[in-house]
């Protein structure tokens, strides 16, 4: 079973935000921090194929305004009940007899089952109250310090408009049962009679507090002399205004190549993908396009020697095995692609660095290149299905995983639609079911699954999730070479 | 003070192409949503093209799509509009329109002055 929160959130934006402007939280420790006038940055996607994700600052808008004062009340909006049911039960059952009286009979039950019920109310900045408060605050001077690093990043930068929330804390439980029964006898003799029976009952239960941020909307943050909020979104919107003047920022010898607003590792890297391609839409938005870019990227780790690859991959097992490791590699490279030189890390992630680095500490493009993409895969999945990736690559078996989901992402087209689709027993191995690997790494992904005619349920929303696996286990199987 | 000046007005046939400008001075160009109204004789002025502040996103009226692009430059504190497959009922004086696009330039809205385009055989 996925996420019973992001099932919850997801069901929850569908009923009430309509015009598609809601984010949805993706995991329950992050929902606290998505408050109005919080601060995040979105975190450019690494592929065409998965959405960028928000991340909070840990600042106020009230941090970077001076002069300093509470921020100004928000508008609590009227309250909304959701409830949401699923019952779904399968049963079958058999009898077999032979002429000679000799009877087996089997029967089998599976059945799932979750109900929410909350209460949900929204909180927002009215647009009277920005404008008051920009007009009687301005941008702190010096600048605050994690506004420098996101500038020097060119990170752009966004604010919490609106949030939905919950009233009171939910429970949220889904339940899997499974019962089976056979009996048989053989009549003769000696007369044979056997019988079995068992069950297995799955539940699953997550508290969500009280206050908690299901879904949030953001406006752009714009700094140049001073703060101002954007009011209609534009995807070519920079946070950091560039200075009027012809100034162009200098970079240390061996840096990024020269790009506007900051170096940024992913401008670098949609360079890189569309050379020599229109920039709009450089790769079509379905599975041949999803497998031209894994390629494109693939082709600069096939150019890796043994041993680097050896290394690398055994540096990144260790981060599939250990989330802040994941972390600090991420913010490392993202350190590295503005700021110069790497500072050095420890275990795991430092093993992957070390791979990435010349002596001068200085990243080398080539080989960082495929690694952001491959990180920006990864941060797009769970920890679950890091610990399987991490196990699939010690035990040299991340083809078969490959295979179901490029089979599945190839057979799901259209994407933007639900769609049931029957897997070929040759893809599952001999592991179907709930805790199988593959049934785990799919479930992950917000597919519903079944098991006794196994089938895949396709949900739209499950698109970025399954792509960026689909690029997890493509690039992490090349680096390993196994045999195709 | 503020001022944009539209250009590039002119008389052309039926299935030919016409490139617009408006240049703007006097406010912060690039906190502005941008523009193109036009108004035929004895109709009233009608939404043609509409894009925001870095240019990232666009919209047309029904009758020009596919035939129309607006685009700006903000280095140039310039707005385009490039018109292709043009027909008679294309007809029109062609306004440029500045309206802010963040909290603080949310009430401003400026007008240009007008380029008269007929098209005809």
């Known amino acids: 079973m996925g996420s019973a929160f992001e099932r919850v959130v997801r069901r929850v934006v569908q009923e009430l935000d309509h015009g598609g402007e809601f984010i949805p939280v993706t995991s329950l420790q992050s929902s606290t921090g998505f408050q109005p006038y919080c601060l995040v940055v979105r975190k450019p996607s690494s592929s065409w194929f998965w959405k960028p994700r928000y991340k909070c600052v840990n600042l106020s808008i009230k941090d970077i305004l001076e002069p300093d004062a509470a921020e100004p009340d928000v508008q609590r909006g009227r309250s909304f009940h959701f409830y949401d049911a699923m019952d779904g039960q399968i049963q079958g059952s058999v009898e077999l007899a032979a002429p000679g009286q000799a009877k087996i009979a089997g029967g089998a039950a599976v059945s799932d089952s979750s109900s929410t019920s909350m209460n949900v109310y929204s909180l927002s900045v009215d647009p009277n109250t920005w404008q008051t408060l920009l007009h009687e605050r301005h941008l702190r001077q010096p600048e605050h310090k994690v506004l420098q690093q996101l500038r020097s990043r060119g990170d752009n930068v966004y604010v919490v408009t609106e949030v939905l929330q919950t009233q009171k804390e939910v429970e949220v439980t889904r339940t899997h049962k499974r019962e089976g029964s056979g009996r048989f006898s053989l009549p003769g003799a000696t007369c044979l009679q056997g019988e079995g029976q068992g069950h297995l009952s799955q539940k699953k239960t997550v508290t969500i507090p009280s206050g908690s941020t299901l879904a949030f909307r953001v406006a752009q943050l714009v700094i140049d002399s001073d703060l101002d909020v954007l009011l209609f979104p534009d995807k070519k919107q920079r946070t950091f205004q560039p200075p009027a003047t012809g100034h162009k920022r200098s970079t240390s010898e061996g840096a990024w190549p020269q790009l506007p607003s900051g170096l940024s590792m992913m401008r670098c890297l949609h360079n890189f993908l569309t050379d020599g391609v229109p920039a709009e839409g450089a790769f079509t938005e379905d599975f041949q396009g999803l497998r031209a870019e894994v390629e494109t990227i693939s082709k600069e780790l096939e150019l890796l020697d043994r041993e680097l690859c050896q290394l690398l991959l055994e540096g990144l097992e260790g981060v599939l095995r250990d989330q802040l490791a994941l972390r600090a590699l991420e913010e490392a490279l993202e350190q590295g692609q503005s700021l110069g030189p790497v500072e050095p890390l420890d275990g795991p992630a430092g093993a992957v660095l070390e791979c990435l680095v010349l002596s001068s500490g200085m990243l080398v493009p080539e080989l960082a290149i495929p690694v952001v993409y491959l990180l920006g895969a990864l941060t797009m999945l769970s920890e679950t299905q890091h610990k399987l990736l991490a196990e699939a690559l010690e035990s040299q078996t991340l083809l078969g995983p490959l295979e179901l989901v490029g089979s599945l992402l190839e057979q799901s087209a259209p994407w933007q639609e639900r769609s049931t689709m029957s897997l070929p027993p040759g893809l599952l191995g001999n592991s179907w079911g709930e805790g199988a690997p593959a049934w785990v790494l799919l479930d992950e992904c917000g597919l519903e699954l079944g098991e006794d005619t196994p089938h895949v349920c396709w949900e739209p929303q499950a698109q970025g999730r399954m792509c960026a696996l689909y690029a997890s286990l493509a690039l992490l199987s090349g680096l390993s070479q196994e045999p195709h | 003070q503020v001022q944009l000046v539209e250009s590039g007005g002119a008389l052309v046939q039926p299935g030919g192409s016409l490139r617009l400008s408006c240049s703007a001075s006097?406010?912060?160009?690039?906190?502005?949503?941008m523009s193109w109204y036009r108004q035929a004789p004895g109709k009233e002025r009608e939404l043609v093209a509409t894009i925001t502040t870095a240019g990232g996103n666009t919209n047309y009226a029904d009758s020009v799509k596919g035939r129309f692009t607006i685009s700006r430059d903000n280095a140039k504190n310039t707005v385009y509009l490039q018109m292709n497959s043009l027909k008679p009922e294309d007809t029109a004086v062609y306004y440029c329109?500045?309206?802010?696009?963040?909290?603080?330039?949310?009430?401003?809205?400026?007008w240009g002055q007008g380029t008269q385009v007929t098209v005809s055989s």
């Open positions: 006097g406010f912060t160009f690039s906190k502005y949503l």
């Open positions: 329109k500045a309206s802010g696009g963040t909290i603080r330039t949310v009430n401003e809205t400026y």
